[in-house]
C-alpha cells in the first residue's frame, strides 16, 4: 500500500537534499522487491516535474497509449508526480556527474506502477514502457545538478543526450557541452508541492 | 475491449442492504481509480463513491456517507459498493465507471470517466 | 457542495450548431468533461479536459473553458446527436455533474 510520504527536502536538487536527513524515508515499493536484481537505489523520491518555465508535466496513461503533456496547470489540478529512483552509476557520463566518490547519480523516471520513461535515441523521443525489472538500461538518466535548484537528465544510453522539451513535448535533445550546458529547454525541477 | 458488468441489484425494503459488484476485464483493473455513479428514474447522474487503485483510499458522495461502503479486490478485477439502511431516494440505476487514465502516484479521483458498464437498478421499496 | 448549472434543454435543427453551458464558480480553473447519454443507454464521454475528444468521437463535438461557464458545442448537429448532455468535473476528489440537457433535434 502507497502512502503519501512527508519528505524534509523541497527540492532533489543536490546531492544534500538527498543524504543530508538521517530520516530517509524509503519509498514502500523498494519495501516490497521492485528494486533492480542485485541493485538496490539509494532512495526513492515523489515529486512532481516541471520545466525551467515552471510548466508541469503531466501522464494520461492507458494499458495501450499515453501522452505526456507539457503545460501550464489549471489551478485546481493537482500535479502529478513521479516516483524517482537513485542509484549509483558505475559509469562515468561525458561530463563529471554529481555522485560520491566519483560516482555518478543515476534516476529511473515512473508516473504510476510498472511504467517508467524510456529514452528512444533512433526516434529522439521519450516514451513510456511498461517493464518488469530488472529495468534496461533506456530508463537509467544521469542526474546532473544544474543552477537554480535545476536538474538535468542524461541518457545512460546515450552521453551528450538529455531529456529536453520541444514543441510541448518531452523528447531527447543532444547538447553541445561548449554552448549549451545550462539551455533551458533541458532543465527541470523536482518538487515536493 | 474494456468491459465493465454490473450486478447485485435487485427489489429491497426500507433499511435493507445489497452488495452490487462490478467485473471488469480488458484492462489492468489494479491501475486505475473506479466509481459508482447512479442516475434515479428521469433524473440526471449523480457520483456516488470512488476507490483509488494507488493505495485504496475511500471518497463518497455527501448523501451516502456512512451507509454505503466502496471495496475493491484486484486479484478478481471486481469493484463492490455495499449498500445498508437503504432510503427510497437510492432507487435508480448504478454504474460502474472506470477512471480514462492509470491513476498517477499522486493519488485520488482526478481524471474523468472513461469507460462506463450498462447498470444495474437498484429498487428501494416497501 | 459545488453546484454545475445546465440549461434543461436545447433545440437546434438539423446541421445548425447547438450550444450546451456547463456554469459553475471558478469553472475554468477546473478541467470540465461532457458526457452524452442516449435513452436506455450508458454515458459516453465526448469531450475531456475541456477540449480533447476521445478517439470515435466525431469531430462536430468540440468544447471550451473559461470564467465561471464550459460550454460543449455540437456543430452540423445530426438527427443522432439528440440525447441528453451533461458535463463534469473533480471537486476535491469527488465528482460533480451538471443536472443535464436534452439535446432536441428538431
Known amino acids: 500500500m502507497h502512502h503519501h510520504h512527508h519528505h524534509h527536502h523541497h527540492h532533489a536538487a543536490g546531492l544534500n537534499d538527498i543524504f543530508e536527513a538521517q530520516k530517509i524515508e524509503w519509498h514502500e515499493a523498494a519495501i516490497e522487491g521492485r528494486s533492480i536484481t542485485g541493485i538496490s537505489p539509494i532512495t526513492e523520491y515523489l515529486a512532481s516535474l516541471s520545466t525551467y518555465n515552471d510548466q508541469s508535466i503531466t501522464f494520461a496513461l492507458e494499458d495501450e497509449s499515453y501522452e505526456i503533456y507539457v503545460e501550464d496547470l489549471k489551478k485546481d489540478k493537482k500535479k502529478d508526480k513521479v516516483l524517482l529512483s537513485y542509484y549509483e552509476s558505475q559509469h562515468p557520463s561525458s561530463e563529471s556527474g554529481d555522485g560520491v566518490d566519483g560516482k555518478m547519480l543515476m534516476v529511473t523516471l515512473s508516473p504510476t506502477k510498472d511504467f517508467w520513461l524510456q529514452a528512444n535515441n533512433k526516434e529522439h523521443s521519450v516514451e513510456l514502457h511498461k517493464c518488469e525489472k530488472p529495468l534496461p538500461d533506456q530508463a537509467f538518466f544521469v542526474l546532473h545538478n544544474r543552477s537554480f535548484n535545476c536538474v538535468s537528465f542524461e541518457c545512460k544510453t546515450d552521453p551528450g543526450v538529455f531529456i529536453g522539451v520541444k514543441d510541448n513535448h518531452l523528447a531527447l535533445i543532444k547538447v553541445d557541452y561548449s554552448e549549451n550546458l545550462g539551455s533551458e529547454n533541458i532543465l527541470f525541477k523536482l518538487s515536493e508541492i | 475491449e474494456v468491459q465493465l458488468l454490473e450486478s447485485g441489484g435487485g427489489l429491497v425494503q426500507p433499511g435493507g442492504s445489497l452488495r452490487l459488484s462490478c467485473a471488469a476485464s480488458?484492462?489492468?483493473?489494479?491501475?486505475?481509480?473506479m466509481s459508482w455513479v447512479r442516475q434515479a428514474p428521469g433524473k440526471g447522474l449523480e457520483w456516488v463513491s470512488g476507490?483509488?487503485?494507488?493505495?485504496?483510499?475511500?471518497y463518497y458522495a455527501d448523501s451516502v456517507k456512512g451507509r454505503f461502503t466502496i471495496s475493491r479486490d484486484n486479484s478478481k478485477n471486481t469493484l463492490y459498493l455495499q449498500m445498508n439502511s437503504l432510503r427510497a431516494e437510492d432507487t435508480a440505476v448504478y454504474y460502474c465507471?472506470?477512471?480514462?487514465?492509470?491513476?498517477?502516484?499522486?493519488?485520488?479521483?482526478?481524471?474523468?470517466?472513461?469507460?462506463w458498464g450498462q447498470g444495474t437498478m437498484v429498487t428501494v421499496s416497501s | 457542495s459545488y453546484v454545475l448549472t445546465q440549461p434543461p434543454s436545447v433545440s437546434v435543427s438539423p446541421g445548425q450548431t447547438a450550444s450546451i453551458t456547463c456554469s459553475g464558480e471558478?469553472?475554468?480553473?477546473?478541467?470540465a468533461a461532457w458526457y452524452q447519454q442516449k435513452p436506455g443507454q450508458s454515458p459516453v464521454l465526448v469531450i475531456y479536459?475541456?477540449?480533447k475528444r476521445p478517439s470515435g468521437i466525431p469531430e462536430r463535438f468540440s468544447g471550451s473553458n473559461s470564467g465561471n461557464t464550459a460550454t460543449l458545442t455540437i456543430s452540423g448537429t445530426q438527427a443522432m446527436d439528440e440525447a441528453d448532455y451533461y458535463c463534469?468535473?473533480?471537486?476535491?476528489?469527488?465528482?460533480?455533474f451538471g443536472g443535464g440537457t436534452k439535446v432536441t433535434v428538431l
Open positions: 476507490i483509488s487503485a494507488i493505495d485504496q483510499s475511500t
Open positions: 465507471a472506470r477512471d480514462l487514465w492509470m491513476e498517477n502516484w499522486v493519488g485520488g479521483l482526478r481524471y474523468p470517466f472513461g469507460y
Open positions: 463534469e468535473v473533480k471537486k476535491s476528489d469527488t465528482g460533480v
Open positions: 479536459r475541456d477540449t
Open positions: 480488458g484492462f489492468t483493473f489494479s491501475s486505475y481509480a
Open positions: 471558478r469553472m475554468g480553473d477546473k478541467y
